[in-house]
């Protein structure tokens, strides 16, 4: 089993959380494993217990401090180790030098709200959560709108190439129910990826005024 393929992937949320996934072909589901984080220039270290998320995949969150505290910087390197229990001892299964700001995945945007809605338009705003002040304005967003009779996968992506925490959706159909989602990504980091999608925001456009041509 050890010679099979494995995956050890971790992301930093830019503040005080490193989330990790460890997968190993042929590994036993009840194996007890953990991730240990040892920064090269900090006095703290942290451990989290890997919990099963699928047949041969485990995940955990290294909580480094208060959610909005800035626990790591661009110069930090964190040695991450996967340790699994074998009998009475812990055995190191994998090691990785982790540069937090090269491996970013932010929290999903929050507090989505309809600022203004009309028959064909809707203005929506949101906030980013637990994002480092280091980014300043170096963030981008993707948004998508779910139309009736379609799936999220079919929804065209709208790209906002700057830190803009609002959008004006246009060419909407009157008196129609829609859902909206947004995600965020820093411009920095070789292995940086998109945040999860936000919780969907449901809204309805206003009906067309009677007697008006729509």
């Amino acid at each position: 089993a050890v010679n099979g393929t494995s995956q050890f992937t971790c992301f930093y949320n830019s503040r005080a959380n490193i989330s990790c996934v460890w997968s190993q072909d042929g590994a036993l589901q009840d194996t007890s494993c953990q991730v240990h984080a040892w920064p090269d220039r900090r006095r703290w270290n942290q451990t989290c217990e890997l919990l099963p998320v699928s047949q041969a995949s485990w995940a955990c969150n290294l909580i480094l401090g208060a959610p909005d505290s800035q626990k790591l910087t661009t110069v930090d390197i964190v040695t991450l180790r996967v340790l699994c229990r074998e009998g009475v001892r812990w055995r190191v299964m994998a090691i990785q030098d982790f540069k937090p700001f090269e491996n970013l995945r932010l929290m999903a945007p929050i507090s989505l709200q309809v600022v203004h809605v009309e028959t064909h338009r809707c203005n929506i705003s949101w906030e980013i959560s637990q994002a480092s002040h280091y980014f300043e304005r170096h963030l981008e967003f993707e948004a998508r709108t779910l139309s009736p009779g379609h799936t999220w996968e079919e929804a065209p992506l709208l790209t906002l190439k700057q830190k803009q925490e609002w959008i004006c959706l246009e060419t909407l159909t009157p008196d129609t129910q829609y859902e909206f989602q947004v995600r965020v990504k820093p411009l920095q980091g070789e292995f940086t990826t998109w945040s999860p999608w936000s919780q969907p925001l449901a809204f309805r456009t206003k009906p067309a005024a009677l007697g008006k041509d729509t």
Partner: nanobody, 121 residues
Framework: QVQLVESGGGLVQAGDSLRLSCAAS????????MGWVRQAPGKEREFVAG????????LYADSVEGRFTISKDNAKNTGYLQMSSLKPEDTAVYYC??????????????WGRGTQVTVSS
């Protein structure tokens, strides 16, 4: 992609020592991990040792722990495997491999062509 070239293999007696080198080029290893994987005749590939390029954290297979030492020279972009107290069962082609992490397995992103180590009794 990283290009890897191994050297230092050869024929030695049981109990002797040998040092393998792995020269990396193509891009900076930065925070990559360099591993050594071996394949004996008629057997599957086997993880030997690994070292992270940033902090020098190491990982060894049980079969070589205490006998083999993995190290690196960042300035030369070269990794080393110092093999001591060699045994006939260490006979294999030794491959250098690089990925974002090292683990006790044999699937890595970049590979060298290998260097033959033969230990006679």
């Amino acid at each position: 992609q990283v290009q890897l070239v191994e050297s230092g293999g050869g024929l030695v007696q049981a109990g002797d020592s040998l040092r393998l080198s792995c020269a990396a080029s193509g891009r900076s290893l930065s925070t990559d991990c360099m591993g050594w994987v071996r394949q004996a005749p008629g057997k599957e590939r086997e993880f030997v040792a690994g070292i992270t390029w940033g902090t020098g954290s190491t990982l060894y297979a049980d079969s070589v722990e205490g006998r083999f030492t993995i190290s690196k020279d960042n300035a030369k972009n070269t990794g080393y495997l110092q093999m001591s107290s060699l045994k006939p069962e260490d006979t294999a082609v030794y491959y250098c491999a690089v990925d974002r992490y090292c683990y006790r397995g044999t699937v890595y992103r970049d590979w060298g062509r290998g260097t033959q180590v033969t230990v006679s009794s």
